[in-house]
Interface confidence: low
Amino acid sequence: QLSLPSILPNENEKVVQLNSSFSLRCFGESEVSWQYPMSEEESSDVEIRNEENNSGLFVTVLEVSSASAAHTGLYTCYYNHTQTEENELEGRHIYIYVPDPDVAFVPLGMTDYLVIVEDDDSAIIPCRTTDPETPVTLHNSEGVVPASYDSRQGFNGTFTVGPYICEATVKGKKFQTIPFNVYALKATSELDLEMEALKTVYKSGETIVVTCAVFNNEVVDLQWTYPGEVKGKGITMLEEIKVPSIKLVYTLTVPEATVKDSGDYECAARQATREVKEMKKVTISVHEKGFIEIKPTFSQLEAVNLHEVKHFVVEVRAYPPPRISWLKNNLTLIENLTEITTDVEKIQEIRYRSKLKLIRAKEEDSGHYTIVAQNEDAVKSYTFELLTQVPSSILDLVDDHHGSTGGQTVRCTAEGTPLPDIEWMICKDIKKCNNETSWTILANNVSNIITEIHSRDRSTVEGRVTFAKVEETIAVRCLAKNLLGAENREL
């Protein structure tokens, strides 16, 4: 949000006399720096210093003691903190020309003579004059090439492959550049970048491998950013595949991984000839050792109805891949002897899902089931109890005379899961017992009648009712009921 720095002189361009000195002042609201045409080796006569002044602004002065043709170019003043490698410098610019009658063109590095163009794209042949007034023509093997010229940049146009020469005349003297070689490369307007990490979870000591592939482009700069980058821990490789189409495969390998190598692995591909950029990222985690986590989707006590089909699903997170087995009452589940099946499927890289399936639940399926997951570093288990719910049924209803005392006990045995409740009813008028309204529930607190209940095992219960004295014929009904059903029998 800082306003752009200001430059004095406040001009877009300035012509400076050969061998004279010149200075450029930059004012900014934060610390400012200069970017200028020459490389650091060539810039011995360029001095940059900070200047104290009474403006409250940061002032940086660029001074050239003896201007030469090589000083011709764009000078940019920018805020230090805004400079990033990717984007063009955002700042204030001034273009300086230093006309030299003996140097018509600004000296260039050898790489500048290689001009890379993409299929039918425009390009710049960077022959820049030291004097803005110098007329320039562009030639190739066929003669003069029509192209627009800007002394700050060079010739701009659509050029066919081959050598090009810039020609200028200064005070009757002819100057020619060495040939600029225009070279065409395969490139697309969008970068097709794919990242592949066969694994994203590792443990200490393993080798991390990540690849990025760029399709249909020859002019690509690819940078890796990853946690171990500062230590230079990774090994990068490039493989160029030409058939059936161009594919550049960049591989990053990080051997002997540690927990510190966990984090984001990013590849950023950039086209060398245009501002097209694409990036892909994957998060890699490195664990000190292998691990297992078990997450059941049900509780530790589960019920199933008789003959029901039911699935019990357990989510497992593990690395390295686990072996998963099921036990029933601490014995390995032998699936072919029961109507119980288990399976394991891989959901994601380190996520697995195991299912225990009851096809038609039977009473004998009740018990303790355990899932065990293990790998070379860890073992985890989860146990739950399964109850097969059986509707209540009466097994037996008998009476027992007490001889001379005239007392009588009726015993009712019932089974079911959950254990049935037993209720007693009596009908005192035998002739009317077909009518439900003639039956009354036997209350516990009636004198001369005692009711008791005893469970014989987990699924069998026995109820008793004792009549101290039976003076007339009565009918007795035993009602056994649980969540799944009720049954009654009469005596």
Epitope: Q1, L8, N10, S55, G56, L57
Partner: antibody, heavy 115, light 107 residues
Framework: EVKLLESGGGLVQPGGSLKLSCAAS????????MSWVRQAPGKGLEWIGE????????NYTPSLKDKFIISRDNAKNTLYLQMSKVRSEDTALYFC????????WGQGTLVTVSA | DIVMTQSHKFMSTSVGDRVSITCKAS??????VAWYQQKPGQSPNLLIY???YRYTGVPDRFTGSGSGTDFTFTISSVQAEDLAVYYC?????????FGGGTKLEIK
Amino acid sequence: EVKLLESGGGLVQPGGSLKLSCAASGFDFSIFWMSWVRQAPGKGLEWIGEINPDSSTINYTPSLKDKFIISRDNAKNTLYLQMSKVRSEDTALYFCARQRFGPYWGQGTLVTVSA
Amino acid sequence: DIVMTQSHKFMSTSVGDRVSITCKASQDVSTAVAWYQQKPGQSPNLLIYSASYRYTGVPDRFTGSGSGTDFTFTISSVQAEDLAVYYCQQYYSTPYTFGGGTKLEIK
């Protein structure tokens, strides 16, 4: 020596208009952002707005945007503040300043809004 | 708008004491903060800019620190002439805003 001199203040009726000027000297006026700041009697400082060197960007404090207009004339080295629809709460000492922050402020011109 | 809060309207101190004035921004303003001194009947006088840079000619007993949302202005040894109102200002984003001011009184 850098100098900023405000003028144009005075007594104005509620709903009226007034144009303040700030004459700059001693520096290259054409490369600096310029600001207006005001201070009501006995109160703190309130930033009014700023204008960039070529007048292509002008920023105002939102509550004053519809009643104040900042402009400049680089040829005359002068900054302006056109005030309209003034109210009693616009009574203040009006300062012009070089940049968004900085050491160079004028001495201020007093605007009094009263019936 | 970014609100700059100076928690103390008044601070009382003695000559030779160390005094710190705080300013809190309602959101991150990086280091785009200036501190001004204003004496009665005068225009504000810049002391610190960019949070910690002392302006030319300002005595080194005045210092500034902080970044983000919390800023501190310190006078290491108060002098009688330091009696004034001190303002912080953010110039990170428009509208630029000032703190309410802290009046330094000498006992």
